[in-house]
Interface confidence: medium
């Protein structure tokens, strides 16, 4: 919205004649009609699309036009418009002779036109007047014009509306280009958003007036950056509201169950190292010479048959000792003092001289082995027992001693941990390679679904306006964490708007 202003300054018609050349009687009582319209390369017929204005009679023949009111007319003439100023225009100014007092077009004789000027071009919005002078054969008109914006309109095209205000619709003043300039403490497109206390957490805090920091549910502290843990949380912390993340050595919903089984029960024997691996769960790392879950079984080092050439093995506290048969020596009886002449090969083995008779080698028949064919073939050498089973020679046959959870001739079958229905409260059991896992029904948790938990109060989506829902497990209730601009137990109310201020 703006105004095209036209200031008529001087009109010269020395001979007092009309455009037709006929003289006015007694002189040309002159008034003006102005037509403002959209740009045309040649100003041509059609409506005055940007507006029209007429003056009263301003003078006779030649005269200067005063700057203020002249006989009831205004100078400058005002042509208001209520659209975006396009930056271009066409202007027609006609000077007419009024023989009487009626200035309407139909009341004038057809040849009452004194002169007509038509100009067109570009015109930017601004305070400066453009001075122009148009001369015809008999007349001269001096005038100036400009386009200015109406009150509260700004910008290059007078298209930006801006009214300063300080109320709940906004807190701003207007810049010369029509952009808003927020008052201190306010921000946002329309300066409706208060600037909270410096450092107030962006998501977890909010404010309804400048320099305030109000915490959303689940948060606390001056800057609303500390979460509130679950009610009843004993040995735990939180990173989001209502959490209870247990400290080292504690477990359970409220972190009140001791997980440090090693310290409190010392289950590992024979100097083994104990490691906690969950609630009532541990792992023993055995010292050499011991085995078993709790390292309670002593390992015989002779079990691996370390003595060769028929040597017998004796367990000792710090290891084992080989007693060698005649003709052999060494830690494992691996060195021989015999030759083929001593017939060292047993069980039908044939002797072959080596190193010019200084040594020998026995070629054993099937089912026998050893450097002197003294051993029956150990059926356990091929490790036939699966899943960590222990192979035992039993005369002509062999057998596998299976680890817990496995069965079958070669320990190849997995004993189902689920067979004994370990999952409580209707939990579903799943066999895993190293144990089992229970999938619990709603309202139960724990490794065996033994812990009764709350029903999820958030399941019914009770929070409004895209709030985040948290379940308070101690009370079977929910808490809504509201987004910016909403409050209430379900975030159902907009934040109270700041009070209005008189400008």
């Amino acid at each position: 919205s703006g105004v095209f202003q036209l200031q008529l300054q001087e009109f010269i018609n020395e001979r007092g004649v009309l455009a037709s050349g006929r003289p006015c009687e007694p002189g040309c009582r002159t008034f003006f009609r102005v037509c403002l319209k959209h740009f045309q390369a040649v100003v041509s017929p059609g409506p005055c699309t940007f507006g029209t204005v007429s003056t009263p009679v301003l003078g006779t023949n030649s005269f200067a036009v005063r700057d203020d009111s002249s006989g009831g007319g205004r100078n400058p003439l005002q042509l208001p418009f209520n659209f975006t100023w396009p930056g271009t225009f066409s202007l027609i100014i006609e000077a007419w002779h009024a023989p009487g007092d009626d200035l309407r077009p139909e009341a004038l004789p057809p040849d009452a036109l004194i002169s007509k000027i038509a100009i067109q071009g570009s015109l930017a919005v601004g305070q400066n007047w453009l001075l122009d002078e148009q001369t015809s054969t008999l007349t001269r008109l001096r005038y100036s014009y400009r386009v200015i914006c109406s009150d509260n309109y700004y910008g290059d095209n007078c298209s930006r509306l801006c009214k300063k205000r300080n109320d709940h619709f906004g807190h701003y003043v207007c810049q010369p280009d029509g952009n808003l300039s927020c008052l201190p403490g306010w921000t946002g497109e329309y300066c409706q958003q208060p600037i909270c206390l410096s450092g107030c957490h962006e998501q977890n805090g909010y404010c309804s007036k400048p320099a305030e920091c109000l915490c959303r549910p689940g948060w606390q502290g001056r800057l609303c950056n500390e979460c509130i843990p679950h009610n009843g949380c004993r040995h735990g912390t939180c990173s989001t509201p209502w959490q209870c993340t247990c400290d080292e050595g504690w477990g359970g919903l409220f972190c009140d169950q001791d997980l440090n089984y090693c310290t409190h029960h010392s289950p590992c024997k024979n100097g083994a190292t104990c490691s906690n691996s969950g609630q009532r769960s541990y792992t023993c790392t055995c010292r050499p010479g011991y085995t078993g879950v709790d390292c309670e079984l002593e390992l015989s080092e002779c079990d691996s048959n370390p003595c060769r050439n028929g040597g017998s093995c004796k367990d000792q506290e710090d290891g084992y000792h080989c007693l060698c048969p005649p003709g052999y020596y060494g830690l494992h009886c691996e060195h021989s003092t015999l030759s083929c002449a001593d017939s060292p090969c047993f069980n039908g083995g044939s002797c072959r001289e080596r190193n010019q008779g200084a040594n020998y080698a026995c070629e054993c028949p099937p089912n026998f082995t050893g450097s002197n064919c003294e051993k029956k073939v150990d059926r356990c050498t091929s490790n036939p027992c699966a899943n960590g089973g222990q192979c035992l020679n039993r005369g002509p046959s062999r057998m596998c001693r299976c680890r817990p959870g496995f069965t079958g001739t070669y320990c190849e079958l997995h004993v189902s941990d689920c067979a004994r229905n370990p999952c409580a409260h209707g939990g579903t059991c799943h066999d895993l390679e190293n144990g089992l896992m229970c999938t619990c029904p709603a309202g139960f948790s724990g490794r065996r679904c033994e812990v009764r938990t709350s029903i999820d109060a958030c399941a019914s989506s009770p929070c409004f306006n895209r709030a985040t829902c948290y379940t308070d497990l101690s009370t079977d209730t929910f808490v809504c964490n509201c987004p910016y601009g909403f409050v209430g137990s379900r975030c159902e109310f907009p934040v109270g708007l700041p009070p209005s201020f008189p400008w």
């Epitope: 959209h38 100003v43 027609i92 077009p105 007509k116």
Partner: antibody
Framework: SGGGLVQPGRSMKLSCAAS????????MAWVRQDPKKGLEWVAT????????YYRDSVKGRFTISRDNAKSTLYLQMDSLRSEDTATYYC??????????????WGQGISVTVSS | DIVLTQSPALAVTLGQRATISCRAS??????????MQWYQQRPGRQPKLLIY???NLASGIPARFSGSGSGTDFTLTIDPVQADDIATYYC?????????FGGGTKLELR
């Protein structure tokens, strides 16, 4: 008046005498019509003769002028081409303040450009 | 230049309504003014102004002629059609220079 048959490249001048209205108050125009191209605006002149405007295809070849004392409009056509063949009408071209919705058209002048 | 498109012919019955349309290649509306005119041309005669600024009846034109439209789509309606309305009708825009005319719609008896 002034129409007829003319050879390509030659000249012709059309005249239009106005009556029944104050000729000197009105901008005037020439419009032509041929069966192929239909109605086509050609040129305009301001009420006092100081401003003129032409369609691109006749610019530099045609000249519009007026004699307000004789209430007559002219169109000087030089370097004529076969595509200038048409019926040429003169008409008033104003309406800012004068009773809008009234128009004065000439009866038309036939111009044929052919060898 | 603004191009105006009209259908070449329209067959009508005397006493019935005739609707002639004109479509502009760009809007011819400015400041709430719809800068479109309608002309009637009988064979061998000069064009005659019927409607100006899309909907205003020109001086001396009977009220059975009416115009409507804005932006790019305009309509001339004759209701009822009479025998001496059989002619060619042209639309013409005055939004931009050069002024341009439509190709004309010939009104024919059914």
């Amino acid at each position: 008046s002034g129409g007829g048959l003319v050879q390509p490249g030659r000249s012709m001048k059309l005249s239009c005498a106005a009556s029944g209205f104050t000729f000197s108050n009105y901008d005037m125009a020439w419009v032509r019509q041929d069966p192929k191209k239909g109605l086509e605006w050609v040129a305009t002149i301001s009420y006092d003769g100081r401003s003129t405007y032409y369609r691109d295809s006749v610019k530099g070849r045609f000249t519009i002028s007026r004699d307000n004392a004789k209430s007559t409009l002219y169109l000087q056509m030089d370097s004529l081409r076969s595509e200038d063949t048409a019926t040429y009408y003169c008409k008033d071209y104003d309406g800012h303040y004068h009773p809008y919705g009234m128009e004065a058209w000439g009866q038309g002048i036939s111009v044929t450009v052919s060898s | 230049d603004i191009v105006l498109t009209q259908s070449p012919a329209l067959a009508v019955t005397l006493g019935q309504r005739a609707t002639i349309s004109c479509r502009a290649s760009q809007s011819v509306t400015i400041s709430n003014y719809n800068l479109m005119q309608w002309y009637q041309q009988r064979p061998g005669r000069q064009p005659k102004l019927l409607i100006y600024d899309a909907s205003n009846l020109a001086s001396g034109i009977p009220a059975r002629f009416s115009g409507s439209g804005s932006g790019t789509d305009f309509t001339l309606t004759i209701d009822p059609v009479q025998a001496d309305d059989i002619a060619t009708y042209y639309c013409q825009q005055s939004r931009d220079d050069p002024r341009t005319f439509g190709g004309g719609t010939k009104l024919e008896l059914r």
